[in-house]
């Protein structure tokens, strides 16, 4: 009679994480009598996966009724596969005895595990940057297998080319991580822009994962200032406006100075938003020219988003206006909302 053979027909099996893996094993004879055991690996530290005779293996079930006397199919199903289950599995026939002794082994089945990458997380620089500067964005995704993965960067749908990507570890592992750094040049129009990291992997069936970062959290568009003198409202009053244009974010503090002395400080509140996401704001100052003997230097000083102040000055010629005697008020705090001006 032909000696018993242990047949593992599948050289390799690939399973998605979370699914069950079926490892096939049949024997060609009922003799000798004895149990089957499954092992992962084959060296001195091999790991027992299933023992037909005894033990508790909650994730392992037999595919056929292995307790039947005539059974020759010892295939097993391992549930809820994770990347840590990858390896080579051996179906081993034992000869009954005290103790049971190993008799024959199958050729082994290599189990590889496909695991989905985590949702990509995109993070930008810690501090805001101004247009024309280059900033770096990072994208990370973890826990995928196999190692092959594709990562692309986009800015508003346009693919970026200036990036570097690493997949770790360098060699084989039960699962992998990807880390990519992209360089993006900011423009004044980028408040509404998005940077997108897109990850494609065999487990995603053509539906890539995306992570996004809004450039509104990264960009700082400094304001442009314009100080203008409005037509005289009364004989002794001049209306001076400071137009603060195209700034982002909104955090802005404006100070009026008369000949270097602080006249009024206010915070931008009711702003108007431009189509590109930047803001405009206007502050105005009523100057009582009769209170001044000499020309007045009016300065609009703006501190934007905690940055060093920028300013614009306007020289008010006092000599051009008749002086009203008895007035001791240099300025009236009558408004700063541009909608009140016109």
């Amino acid at each position: 009679e032909e000696e018993l053979q242990v047949i593992q027909p599948d050289k390799s099996v690939s399973v998605a994480a979370g699914e069950s893996a079926i490892l096939h094993c049949t024997v060609t004879s009922l003799i000798p009598v004895g149990p089957i055991q499954w092992f992962r690996g084959a060296g001195p530290a091999r790991e027992l996966i299933y023992n037909q005779k005894e033990g508790h293996f909650p994730r392992v079930t037999t595919v056929s009724e292995s307790t039947k006397r005539e059974n020759m199919d010892f295939s097993i199903s391992i549930s809820n596969i994770t990347p840590a289950d990858a390896g080579t599995y051996y179906c081993v026939k034992f000869r009954k005895g005290s103790p049971d002794t190993e008799f024959k082994s199958g050729a082994g089945t290599e189990l590889s595990v496909r695991a989905k990458p985590s949702a990509p997380v995109v993070s930008g620089p810690a501090a805001r940057a101004t247009p024309q500067h280059t900033v770096s964005f990072t994208c990370e995704s973890h826990g995928f297998s196999p190692r092959d993965i594709t990562l692309k960067w986009f800015k508003n749908g346009n693919e970026l080319s200036d990036f570097q990507t690493n997949v770790d570890p360098v060699g084989e592992s039960v699962s992998y991580s990807i880390h990519s750094t992209a360089k993006v040049v900011l423009t004044r129009e980028d408040v509404h822009s998005q940077v997108i990291c897109e990850v494609a992997h065999v487990t995603l069936q053509g539906d890539p994962l995306r992570g996004t970062a809004n450039l509104s959290e990264t960009i700082r568009v400094p304001p442009t200032l314009e100080v203008t003198q409005q037509p005289v409202r009364a004989e002794n009053q001049v209306n001076v406006t400071c137009q603060v244009r195209k700034f982002y974010p909104q955090r802005l503090q404006l100070t009026w100075l008369e000949n270097g002395n602080v006249s009024r400080t206010e915070t931008a509140s009711t702003v108007t938003e431009n189509k590109d996401g930047t803001y405009n704001w206007m502050s105005w100052l009523l100057v009582n020219v009769s209170a001044h003997r000499d020309d007045v230097k009016l300065t609009c000083q703006v501190e934007h988003d905690g940055q060093p102040a920028v300013s614009k000055s306007h020289d008010l010629k006092v000599s051009a206006h008749p002086k009203e005697q008895g007035s001791n008020t240099a300025a009236e705090n009558t408004g700063s909302n541009e909608r009140n001006i016109y």
């Epitope: 060296g43 001195p44 390896g87 082994s105 084989e172």
Partner: antibody, heavy 123, light 107 residues
């Protein structure tokens, strides 16, 4: 195809140190453990120990503890055997040999071998 | 350590002969045994693993058998290219150990 290519022969004096390299190609280096095997002239094979190429952890057989060290340069897919304070008894051919099992936690048999590096120790 | 004894240091054979090389383990190693062929000046070549499983590409005239402590490598139809040293190896426990080898020569 899978290849293990070892560095060339070495002639050393007693007390010196030798470092042998084993460059792997044709497979992902850190999947499979790497063992080192000694064969003295006209003699049998002796397993010296192995290194887990994923973790970098090495295990030396008792007879080879002390003067023998296994190391890796993962980026170069290369394993190294270093022998310190050489003696005449270290004259042998040294083989690197790859484990059959991906993600294996112990070596078993060896389907792939380097061509061997002859180390001669002579005063 | 487990000692793998190959009592026949040399074996004389003829072409097309049937040759059996034996290996005895000093303690039970189950079926954790491999066999290698080594030709002069070359590295060993794996023939058999798990005592009886032929490695990929190995001609079917090579057969392994045995379990526990007694193992045999059989060459059923000796060819001239089979003249070499043959080593058994156990991987049941650390340290892995090899037999001292059996050299096949032509009568």
């Amino acid at each position: 195809q899978i290849q293990l290519v070892q560095s060339g022969p070495e002639l050393k004096k007693p007390g010196e140190t030798v470092k042998i390299s084993c460059r792997a190609s044709g497979y992902t280096f850190t999947t499979y453990g790497m063992s080192w095997v000694k064969q003295a002239p006209g003699k049998g094979l002796r397993w010296m120990g192995w290194i887990n190429t994923y973790s970098g952890v090495s295990t030396c057989a008792d007879d080879f503890k002390g003067r023998f060290a296994f190391s890796l340069e993962t980026s170069a897919t290369t394993a190294y055997l270093q022998i310190h304070n050489l003696t005449n008894e270290d004259t042998a051919t040294y083989f690197c040999a790859r484990d059959p099992h991906s993600y294996g936690n112990s070596p078993a048999w060896f389907p792939y071998w380097g061509q061997g590096t002859l180390v001669t120790v002579s005063a | 350590d487990i000692v793998m004894t190959q009592s026949q240091k040399f074996m004389s054979t003829t072409i097309r002969d049937r040759v059996s090389i034996t290996c005895k383990a000093s303690q039970n190693v189950g079926i954790s045994v491999a066999w290698y062929q080594q030709k002069s000046g070359q590295s060993p070549k794996l023939l058999i693993y798990s005592a009886s499983n032929r490695y990929t590409g190995v001609p079917d005239r090579f057969t392994g058998s045995g379990s526990g402590t007694d193992f045999t490598l059989t060459i059923s139809n000796m060819q001239s290219e089979d003249l070499a040293d043959y080593f058994c190896q156990q991987y049941s426990s650390y340290p892995l150990t090899f037999g001292s080898g059996t050299k096949l020569a032509i009568k």
